[in-house]
Interface confidence: low
């Protein structure tokens, strides 16, 4: 269980990650970039790799800059991995990152922090019963 | 508390229709992957079908292909099962079942069952 | 479509034994089974899932093991509530399929 705990952690990083960026919406290139969203029962962790995928980049105007680079590095790092991930199922055939529909940083960031999200209360309620309204 | 409740069972003739509905609560139903198990008087369980969360993925069991289709409606926390053309050997108590995301392998929600009988 | 055979169909046994059930799938399904628990008129209640997860708050005398084409599924001391018919199911490839189901009765 204990990787599935590191894992928890590392997801609520990212958030904290995508967060962060969120404040500094304005100095990312402009440039549209395939979000998911709606993402496909099973294929979520296929989403969660174009979102890492995608050439999310800093603006390069004045002092941020090292504090955004730094945060797209953290961001693209791998989640330790997990049985569910690394046993993304076979049987489906998951749509390409460039099936996506393309947004723009913000709506981007936006999405990315939904799925990450959802991520966190799956694994959650794979292990636990009860009310899952969250 | 997570819930599933079926209905729309009923006594039908062969050939004739049926809808099923299941409405679920206590859990974000639009993240999940939804089935329709039977299972026959006396006998063992047969899956019939399946749905993604978003409705890109159906399948369903080679007995009741072209006959049965699955949908869903997120917006109203809904799974449904249009029955046609249904023949005696489609008599059973059907479940609603949640099946988990994310690689998890297992149904591990079932409602209560409605039961369907086809008879002339 | 994959096959799965429970064996056996049928068993008896007695309070505080140690019974092992068995599934053996027609092809190599990784760990992708779940076991269910069902009584007589009511739903199957998943057990485990993924082969040898077991699902929260069910009792830890229950266990699974297996990962290929075999699985089993070990009761390590039979309760009295845990007379019932048991099914395993695979997931690994569309029909998802269920074995024939094993009947636990009482000696």
């Known amino acids: 269980m204990q990787g599935q705990d590191r894992h928890m952690i590392r997801m609520r990083q990212l958030i904290d990650i995508v967060d962060q960026l969120k404040n500094y919406v304005n100095d990312l290139v402009p440039e549209f970039l395939p979000a998911p969203e709606d993402v496909e029962t099973n294929c979520e962790w296929s989403a969660f790799s174009c979102f890492q995928k995608a050439q999310l980049k800093s603006a390069n105007t004045g002092n941020n800059e090292r504090i955004i680079n730094v945060s797209i590095k953290k961001l693209k790092r791998k989640p330790p991995s997990t049985n569910a991930g690394r046993r993304q199922k076979h049987r489906l055939t998951c749509p390409s990152c460039d099936s996506y529909e393309k947004k723009p940083p913000k709506e981007f960031l936006e999405r990315f922090k939904s799925l990450l999200q959802k991520m966190i209360h799956q694994h959650l309620s794979s292990r636990t019963h009860g009310s899952e309204d969250s | 508390e997570v819930q599933l409740v079926e209905s729309g069972g009923g006594l039908v003739k062969p050939g004739g229709s049926l809808r099923l509905s299941c409405a679920a609560s206590?859990?974000?139903?639009?993240?999940?992957?939804m089935n329709w198990v039977r299972q026959a008087p006396g006998k063992g369980l047969e899956w019939v079908s399946s749905i993604t969360s978003g409705s890109y993925y159906i399948h369903y069991a080679d007995s009741v292909k072209g006959r049965f289709t699955i949908s869903r409606d997120n917006a109203k926390n809904s799974l449904y099962l249009q029955m046609n053309s249904l023949r005696a050997e489609d008599t059973a108590v059907y479940y609603c079942?949640?099946?988990?995301?994310?690689?998890?392998?297992?149904?591990?929600?079932w409602g209560q069952g409605t039961t369907v009988t086809v008879s002339s | 479509a994959i096959q799965l055979t429970q064996s056996p169909s049928s068993l008896s046994a007695s309070v505080g034994d140690r019974v092992t059930i068995t599934c053996r799938a027609s092809n190599d399904i990784d760990s992708a089974l779940a076991w269910y628990q069902q009584k007589p008129g009511k739903a199957p209640k998943i057990l485990i899932h993924d082969a040898s997860s077991l699902e929260s708050g069910v009792p830890s005398r229950f266990s699974g093991s297996g990962s290929g084409t075999d699985f089993t599924l070990t009761i390590s001391s039979l309760q009295p509530e845990d007379f019932a018919t048991y099914y395993c199911q695979q997931f690994n490839s569309y029909p998802y399929t269920f074995g024939q189901g094993t009947k636990l009765e009482i000696k």
């Open positions: 206590g859990f974000i139903f639009s993240s999940y992957s």
């Open positions: 079942v949640r099946e988990r995301g994310w690689g998890y392998y297992g149904m591990d929600v």
